[in-house]
């Protein structure tokens, strides 16, 4: 015989769910002892099974999962998977926060990315901050130029895709580039969308010989400028 | 060719639920967010909810909040609102429409293309 | 939430002359990254609405250059240099910046 255990603690480390109105929560708990445990879920302390809440709950005893679809702030509060067997019982908290403010397409931090200038084969930093209440995509774009051109005959930019990552709101992405040449000299952007839509900023990256003059050996390895 | 074709719209009584249907053709979907737009009969427009590209996050209008549910399966480039507790200010004509994709936009990043539209009439 | 406000309400036009709509944001829809989201849309009769002009100024494909977006801020105006007769039908300004995202009321516009 076993008391409960978790056995994917891993999963349970996000206790605060911090989520939109309108979208969908699901907490997991995901046990196992001897005998079988089984799983009660408690809201603010009570006995939880959802019958007040427009929309019901969905119990998935096998996945030891809680689901409320559509959340409104009424549902806000502190969810407890209790999982207990003849043996003892083990009991972990969430807490749900829903959110009501108005998603906006995502906010770059001004002078972000900022132009700079390197040596050859230094390494550079680009930043970018974005601000978003939607979790933002986030691209790393260099602009290139295609049969001489760096414009489509749609009037576009030909572009070509560096990095690819999904952030928390308020992180700062960072693009690095290492051993930088000649090449990679150019137009950089940072292109964040999110569901309401799109924002991005560009920064220019200038690459200067190893033997320019007006580098000296004290000068940092990349210079930031306006 | 680009195209949004809605579906499942009706007449249902209040209190009541209907499921729209809109199938995506023409672009990468599962690379857009999508959106609900109604038109109440002879009214202006009213938007009425967004969904992510990968359906993570979802916006509602506050005369929806609760009641509707938007939802998507790229596996089949299709978009769902699943419309519960009907009511008769829910009549309208209910458009799909392409949000923003991911990637730079050559163009308007989104809200350029637009599904005929499918009519829901809640009565009693 | 933001409120569009559009005037006139209806306009009847002379065809071959200008023609102007108005749409007043309730709060800035200049956003950090230097771009206005308006959006303009004509909707004319049993159709879906069909984009004119995106992020205040553009015209979307396909557009004739008659139509034309101006504006800053929360002050925006669609132009149509020399009205036609295909021209009439309703047309709607659309805030693009945040949800929930919000329309004018309308404008309907005919032809004399």
């Known amino acids: 015989q076993q008391a409960p255990y978790w056995t994917h603690p891993q999963r349970m480390e996000k206790k605060l769910h911090a989520v939109p109105a309108g979208n969908t929560v699901k907490f997991r708990c995901p046990a196992a002892g001897n005998p079988t445990p089984t799983i009660r879920w408690l809201k603010d302390g009570q006995a939880f099974h959802g019958e007040n809440r427009i929309g019901g709950i969905r119990l998935r005893h096998q996945h030891w999962s809680l689901v409320m679809e559509s959340v409104v702030p009424s549902d806000r509060g502190t969810y407890t998977c209790l999982v207990e067997n003849a043996v003892g019982s083990i009991r972990y908290n969430y807490l749900l926060d829903v959110l009501e403010r108005s998603p906006h397409r995502p906010i770059l931090q001004a002078g972000l990315p900022a132009n700079t200038t390197a040596v050859v084969g230094s390494d550079v930093e680009l930043l970018c901050k974005v601000y978003s209440d939607a979790q933002p995509h986030i691209q790393w774009l260099k602009h290139i130029v295609i049969n001489g051109s760096s414009f489509g005959a749609d009037g576009f930019p030909y572009v070509q895709v560096l990095k690819t990552a999904d952030i928390n709101s308020s992180e700062v992405e960072v693009l690095y580039l290492r051993n930088v040449s000649a090449e990679d000299a150019g137009e950089y952007t940072c292109l964040a969308g999110n569901s309401i839509g799109l924002s991005y900023q560009s920064a220019w990256l200038t690459v200067l010989p190893e033997e320019d003059p007006t580098w000296t050996a004290a000068a940092p390895e990349a210079r930031y400028t306006d | 060719e680009v195209q949004l074709l809605e579906s499942g719209g009706g007449v249902v009584q209040p209190g009541r639920s209907l499921r729209l249907s809109c199938a995506a053709s023409?672009?990468?979907?599962?690379?857009?967010?999508m959106h609900w737009v109604r038109q109440a009969p002879g009214k202006g427009l009213e938007w009425v909810a967004v969904i992510s590209y990968d359906g993570s996050n979802k916006y509602y209008a506050d005369s929806v909040k609760g009641r509707f549910t938007i939802s998507r399966d790229n596996s089949k480039n299709t978009l769902s609102l699943q419309m519960n507790s009907l009511r008769v200010e829910d009549t309208a004509i209910y458009y799909c429409v392409r949000g923003a994709g991911l990637g730079y936009p050559n163009g308007p990043d989104g809200f350029d293309i637009w599904g005929q539209g499918t009519m829901v009439t809640v009565s009693s | 939430d933001i409120v569009m406000t559009q005037t006139p309400l209806s306009l009847s036009v002379t065809p071959g002359q200008p023609a102007s709509i108005s749409c007043t944001s309730s709060?800035?829809?200049?956003?950090?990254?230097?771009?206005?989201?308006v959006y303009w849309y004509v909707q004319k009769s049993g159709q879906p609405p069909q984009l004119l002009i995106y992020?205040?100024?553009n015209r979307f494909s396909g557009v004739p250059d008659r139509f034309s977006g101006s504006g800053s801020r929360t002050d925006f105006t669609l132009k149509i240099s020399r009205v036609e007769a295909e021209d009439v039908g309703v047309y709607y300004c659309m805030q693009y910046i945040e949800a929930p995202l919000t329309f004018g009321g309308g404008t309907k516009v005919e032809i004399k």
């Open positions: 023409g672009f990468t979907f599962s690379s857009y967010a």
């Open positions: 992020e205040l100024s």
């Open positions: 709060r800035s829809l200049l956003h950090s990254d230097g771009k206005t989201y």
